[in-house]
């Protein structure tokens, strides 16, 4: 038989970036992997020139994964670097609760990664704690805004916060810098993903920065500490917005009210819409100074009319086991206005 070989030789002019060698120093990192790969594009019939990432200028492939513990030298052989993106995963875990308690870690994209000429898509931190021993608190460098339909984020990046427990479908939400959320406390394992949306992220990278600390265990799924600004309305919504707060889950908002201000708390629906299969869904609004509280049955009562709070207060929402299709989703806002008369 005759052996026929059909092959194609592709000669392409390297871009400026292809002539450079980029150093990615992950030698001081632990439990981290960085993958550079093609962005998804639907199959095209058109011939597309090659796009490769090269390690040490020798081994070239369309996908490359770098792991922590080493210093890597990479270069690119690609006609259009926008065809690539990178995704990074890093795990921060605590196995010994006595050692970890109060320990803090900075969640920041290393500068070597920021300097690569490829779009950073996601940088995910998996934060793991010993079950029922410790919880986590996230403190942003800049206060965060929760992405809502009424007030969407319009920054070049956001933090997506979700449970990292496989059996638990809990998405806390998307948060971007420039809001009123001072900290987020979560009960157990979570993933925090910094997702970028535009090239301007390179310039705005200084606005990123979260600190995670291991704190004593608490029972609520999440606690949001909110310090509203006088200038704008703060929109807040329950986790798992479209799918509904998971069964028997409890979340709280600790809302600060400055001495010279009054906070107006407004709910955006007349009724919660939840129908309980078992248990009760309720909401507690508690004044922090006097401990006076109002309790609302979310599966029966109408939601409260706009209420005015002269002191810091708590909003706690606890879910029942809802009937499928009748989930608990609540959106509310807090607006500060100057006090006209001292009512203390």
């Amino acid at each position: 038989g005759i052996l026929r070989l059909q092959f194609q030789v592709l000669v392409q002019h390297p871009q400026n970036e292809s002539n450079k060698i980029y150093v990615v120093d992950l030698s001081n990192e632990r439990a981290m992997s960085l993958t550079i790969e093609p962005r998804p594009v639907k199959q095209s019939r058109k011939f597309v020139p090659g796009c490769f990432v090269c390690l040490e200028s020798r081994t070239c492939s369309s996908n490359l994964t770098l792991t922590s513990g080493s210093k890597h030298k990479i270069s690119f052989l690609c006609d259009d670097l926008t065809r690539l993106w990178m995704n990074v995963e890093k795990t921060i875990s605590c196995t010994d609760h006595r050692y970890c308690q109060r320990k803090s870690y900075s969640l920041q994209v290393p500068s070597d990664i920021l300097h690569l000429p490829v779009e950073l898509h996601d940088f995910s931190w998996k934060l793991l704690v010993p079950k029922d021993r410790l919880s986590l608190v996230l403190v942003p460098a800049q206060k965060l805004q929760q992405h809502t339909h009424e007030k969407p984020c319009n920054t070049s990046f956001s933090y997506l916060v979700a449970s990292a427990i496989p059996s638990q479908d809990l998405y806390f939400g998307s948060f971007c810098p420039g809001g009123s959320i001072k900290q987020i406390q979560v009960k157990q394992n979570i993933s925090v993903t910094l997702r970028t949306f535009a090239p301007s992220f390179q310039q705005e990278a200084s606005r990123q920065g979260l600190t995670v600390s291991f704190i004593p265990y608490f029972k609520e799924e999440g606690v949001f500490t909110v310090t509203p600004d006088t200038k704008s309305k703060v929109y807040l919504r329950t986790p798992n917005w479209d799918r509904g707060l998971p069964s028997l889950t409890s979340v709280s908002w600790n809302i600060s009210v400055p001495r010279d201000q009054v906070a107006c708390l407004t709910f955006f629906k007349e009724r919660s819409g939840v129908v309980c299969q078992t248990g009760r869904a309720f909401m507690i609004i508690q004044e922090q100074r006097t401990r006076a509280e109002e309790i609302f049955s979310l599966d029966e009562d109408v939601l409260p009319k706009p209420s005015f709070h002269h002191h810091s207060f708590w909003v706690n929402i606890s879910n029942c086991s809802p009937t499928s299709g009748k989930q608990l989703d609540l959106l509310f806002s807090v607006t500060l206005t100057p006090r006209t008369v001292d009512l203390t």
């Epitope: 962005r39 998804p40 639907k42 898509h121 969407p152 319009n154 997702r195 535009a198 479209d242």
Partner: antibody, heavy 122, light 107 residues
Framework: QVQLVESGGGVVQPGRSLRLSCAAS????????MHWVRQAPGKGLEWVAV????????YYADSVKGRFTISRDNPKNTLYLQMNSLRAEDTAVYYC???????????????WGQGTMVTVSS | DIQMTQSPSTLSASVGDRVTITCRAS??????LAWYQQKPGKAPKFLIY???SLESGVPSRFSGSGSGTEFTLTISSLQPDDFATYYC?????????FGGGTKVEIK
Amino acid sequence: QVQLVESGGGVVQPGRSLRLSCAASGFTFSSYGMHWVRQAPGKGLEWVAVVWYDGTIKYYADSVKGRFTISRDNPKNTLYLQMNSLRAEDTAVYYCASQYSSGWHTDFFDVWGQGTMVTVSS
Amino acid sequence: DIQMTQSPSTLSASVGDRVTITCRASQSISTWLAWYQQKPGKAPKFLIYKASSLESGVPSRFSGSGSGTEFTLTISSLQPDDFATYYCQQYSGYSLTFGGGTKVEIK
């Protein structure tokens, strides 16, 4: 081949609700942002909403904010648009469209469905 | 929101003509602009992205140019199949907007 098929349109009274579906095939649905775009009779195209490929982030046009909800079910390769408190001005052909890629500045549409007509009238 | 203004709204031309459609943005959108063609009763068809990159399978008589706020779609030699309505779309921000459309009709 790559295909999007909308369903769920019809005639509905003002103030009522309707849910549109869009079934995707021929591509990895879970890798792409999905959008709804509408076109009123004899008028131009109007973008309605987007949902990120993994369902985490959504944006809406001001004209539908608070009334419409976009969602997706990746295992079922299906996109949805829940339309509440419908108004006469929501009357249009609703197209679902898949964005070109994912990531920075790729929200233009290389695949469109055939459209489904929604008429809001008393 | 960024407004997109297309001109002219209607254009009469003959087969073989060179046709130019203009799209203006109310603020700079760099080159984040796409063009579509739509025929009556049909879904739009994607032609051009990033102001000037031609989609695979689109005839080379179509070309796009421009950056910032001013963009053009040019059909170098109009064919019978090209009589349709053309729309520009910006994707610079989170809220996407289309131009009002330009109908290319037979003179």
